[in-house]
């Protein structure tokens, strides 16, 4: 019966142990624990390799230790003279004495306690596919964000379902696309357009790379489209094998992507659109609308492109255009976004030269680089004048964005040599 | 420098001082020093200084020390077991690549290299400036920079001078078109310790500039005529060596 702790004493302890004794103790603690065995007393006849008398500690087929002689604790605050830690729940202790003892030896006193083992780190085989969590007496597996634990409680997959796409036009891609998609996952995407719109899916052959079918032609990883009672697919392989335009004849489409444990590829990317409250044409300075129409209606999408030298700053990254949608409330989406002058930022420093601070760093501003005269001159021409261009770079008419190079002037002494008359 | 005058480093801002062996060199850009092969053949990690007229220890401490990264000796320079017995100074030219770029200013700036056109072919009588801290009439080594102006002379003038302390037969000394002979006027000449310094000639296409027409190489006898490495013959090798051993910052 496993126990959490116990005591092991040599025969007759604390009196002298008898000659010609062989005694063994089988220690067992509950599953999921290791054993900490420690000796608080050790007084056994000393011999080379403990050949005469000894206490042996055995774990499975491995001898963890063989003790004899006298030991005393190195730590004044601890009675422990020798200790063993094993990550298994069984241990055998064997005490042997030979036919004679030259002196009176009192043997040993030992204690064992069950200790937690770390199944996550103490063994070669990692039990979990992703994250392993140790607890006293066992362990459990867990998953990174967006993954979930399968029924085997060891492997994780991605819970990539639940996305509902209601926009009139959009793009859907497998998780991580174009990086390999996750293993062991089922991803379900739903497109739900208002009634009166048919979902049309367009795929490019090169935007599809899914683990190929087995020899029987069954897809190991697959992409399936389900529109009402009609199914398109399953599809798999390198290059999309189905029609590049799928007219679903439905406003609702379920996209199911199923992956197994092996052979992840880059996945897939598709575009979809829906085939037919007006929104007013707003005045957005420094931009053009595409397409230009006399009237815009619900679900119309325009691309607003900034004029050269202007940009829309979204999420701290400059873009030259953005999309706006005529919404059901008669207002345009992204109405807060505006085209503002490009900021080229602080000009770069150059070696052996300088640039004067410009009054402005916005589009059209001009800066001038100069070299540290008279010791350096501008080697690569261009005159040193740069303007803030529409792409956000400081640009020179000759060098483009390349910076001027200040190189040493050669062969000019600061003072001419004058021979002194003798 | 024999028969020369006191000079200021501002007259020769390209002048580089080598302390072992005691010699000279010429700064040709931020990363490169041109010198004579015989200066660096025995010490591939020379310590160099720029920007100081005086090479007194206390003054050198305040000047700019240059650290070499690599020494490139011309492949045509023959390395000898016993350099002291050398009679062949052909291809006496070397480049020293510096670890860090030199900051230019009034006391430190490079000398130009000769162009490849015939404008840079020297004629007898063309004047050049030499400078250095080598032997003078009075002492073995100068503490303050000396300089002299001397004319280019026909090579035979150098051949005619008897070698002062010959280490071999007079016929053994090699004279080649890679050498310039200069001097013979008022006893002005370069001497031991001036090696590697520039023989600076006014640029024919820009009178405000000087170029390194020669490098102090060897001579039969100080105070007569001296032989200088003809730098024009090595411009291709200099440019190729610098190009192949440059960093992105320089390109």
């Amino acid at each position: 019966e496993p126990t959490m702790y116990g005591e092991i004493l040599s025969p007759n302890y604390p009196q002298a142990y008898p000659s010609e004794v062989e005694k063994s103790w089988d220690i067992e603690v509950p599953e999921g624990y290791g054993i900490h065995l420690y000796f608080t007393h050790l007084d056994i006849e000393l011999s080379e390799n403990c050949a005469y008398d000894s206490v042996q500690i055995i774990s499975g087929d491995t001898e963890e230790g063989r003790l004899c002689g006298q030991r005393s604790s190195n730590n004044p605050h601890s009675p422990i003279v020798e200790e063993f830690q094993v990550p298994y729940n069984k241990l055998q202790v064997i005490f042997k004495s030979d036919f004679s003892n030259e002196e009176r030896f009192t043997g040993f006193a030992a204690y064992y306690v069950a200790t937690d083992i770390n199944e996550c780190t103490d063994f070669v085989d990692v039990p979990c596919s992703h994250f392993c969590n140790n607890f006293i007496g066992g362990y459990f597996c867990s998953c990174p964000p967006e993954y979930f634990l399968h029924d085997d409680m060891k492997n994780c997959g991605v819970n990539c379902s639940g996305d509902v796409f209601t926009a009139l036009i959009g793009e859907i891609a497998s998780p991580n696309y174009p990086k390999p998609y996750p293993e062991n996952s089922r991803c379900e995407y739903q497109i739900r357009l208002e009634k009166g719109f048919q979902v049309v899916v367009t795929l490019r052959r090169e935007d599809f790379d899914v683990e190929a079918a087995d020899s029987a032609g069954n897809c190991l990883d697959s992409l399936v489209f389900v529109a009402g009672d009609r199914q398109f697919g399953p599809y798999c392989g390198h290059g999309f094998p189905g029609p590049l335009n799928i007219e679903t004849k439905s406003n609702a489409l379920d996209i199911i992507f199923q992956t197994d444990l092996t052979g992840q590829k880059k996945g897939w990317k598709l575009r979809y659109h829906g085939d037919p409250m007006p929104c007013p044409k707003e005045d957005t300075p420094n931009s053009v609308w595409e397409p230009a129409k006399a009237k815009y209606v619900f679900r119309d999408v325009v691309q607003i492109t900034c004029l050269d030298g202007f940009e829309v700053v979204e999420g701290r990254v400059g873009a030259t255009s953005f999309y706006s949608t005529c919404q059901s409330n008669g207002k345009w989406s992204n109405s807060k976004l505006k085209c503002q002058p490009v900021d080229c930022g602080i000009p770069e420093s150059i070696e052996n030269g300088k640039v004067e601070d410009p009054e402005s760093t916005l589009f059209g501003s001009v800066i001038r680089y100069t070299c540290e005269e008279p010791y350096y001159y501008m080697e690569n021409g261009g005159g040193g004048e740069y303007h803030c261009a529409g792409n956000g770079s400081w640009v020179n008419e000759v060098l483009g964005p390349e910076l001027p190079k200040c190189v040493p002037v050669c062969g000019v002494p600061r003072e001419p040599f004058e021979e002194k008359q003798r | 420098i024999i028969g020369g005058s006191d000079a200021d480093i501002k007259n020769f801002p390209w002048q580089v001082f080598f302390d072992n062996p005691w010699a000279g060199g010429a700064l040709i850009n931020e990363y490169w020093v041109l010198t004579a092969a015989h200066v660096v053949e025995g010490n591939r990690e020379p310590t160099m200084y720029v920007g100081s007229t005086s090479v007194q220890t206390s003054r050198l401490a305040k000047s700019k020390m240059l650290t070499p990264e690599h020494v490139f000796i011309h492949p045509g320079w023959k390395l000898l077991e016993v350099p002291e017995g050398r009679t062949n100074f052909d291809n006496d030219i070397a480049l020293v690549r510096l670890k860090d770029p030199v900051k230019m200013g009034p006391t430190v700036s490079p000398i130009c290299l000769p162009g490849t056109s015939s404008d840079y072919n020297l004629m007898d009588g063309d004047l050049g400036l030499i400078s250095g801290w080598g032997r003078t009439e009075k002492r073995d080594r100068a503490v303050r920079l000396k300089a002299a102006r001397l004319p280019v002379a026909p090579l035979r003038k150098c051949k005619e001078v008897k070698v002062e302390k010959p280490t071999a037969d007079a016929e053994a000394y090699v004279f080649t078109p890679n050498m310039i002979c200069a001097g013979g006027e008022k006893g002005m000449d370069s001497c031991k310790g001036d090696s590697g310094g520039a023989f600076a000639v006014q640029d024919p296409n820009d009178k405000t500039k000087f170029y390194a027409a020669g490098l102090v190489s060897w001579g039969p006898q100080c105070g007569t005529y001296g032989l200088y490495t003809r730098v024009k013959n090595y411009v291709d090798w200099i440019m190729k060596t610098m190009q192949e051993n440059s960093t992105p910052r320089e390109d």
């Epitope: 701290r316 930022g345 770069e348 420093s349 410009p358 910076l403 | 992105p248």
Partner: antibody, heavy 118, light 109 residues
Amino acid sequence: EVMLVESGGGLVKPGGSLRLSCAASGFTFSNYAMSWVRQAPGKGLEWVATISSGGSHTYYLDSVKGRFTISRDNSKDTLYLQMNSLRAEDTALYYCARLFTGHAMDYWGQGTLVTVSS
Amino acid sequence: QIVLTQSPATLSLSPGERATLSCTASSSVSSSYLHWYQQKPGKAPKLWIYSTSNLASGVPSRFSGSGSGTDYTLTISSLQPEDFATYYCHQYYRLPPITFGQGTKLEIK
């Protein structure tokens, strides 16, 4: 030899102020844009602010905008960072750095420690 | 803002081995504005590689840098004991903030 030496760090209570200085030498200070970068104990580098060579243009990390001011005195070859309304999360080693080609930070000071704690 | 993600967070290798440190940007970065720094404990960072592939002064030739767009790499061909340190990638973009990666600690195995 290019040198940047920061000073002015210390222990300050939340809501307090500090002014950091960075003394530059060995280069023409007025030719270079400069930055402050900080590093919280045991953490990575975080850019704080940048100033142009002449001091007319400044950029800040959002979390310090309105509380910190970067400035420079080119006549004294010194860069400053005035830090007001300090918070515990501003605790870090603050470095000044010189900006070079591509806005790479080619020279850094040794750093000055700012500790914000009650 | 442009987020730089360095991988791995820690790299344990032995001297003589080849090390590859990766830096991935959330948006495309100009190769002229992507730099690497080396930092040792208790010391200030040092510019190590600038503009993707140019070694800073004094950096040994066993180091190299490459990349474009969103993916950049620092490679050490044969690790020397003095190379064990933390390496940060850094990008400049004209709109603040300027960002650093979280660092890769290169440690002796």
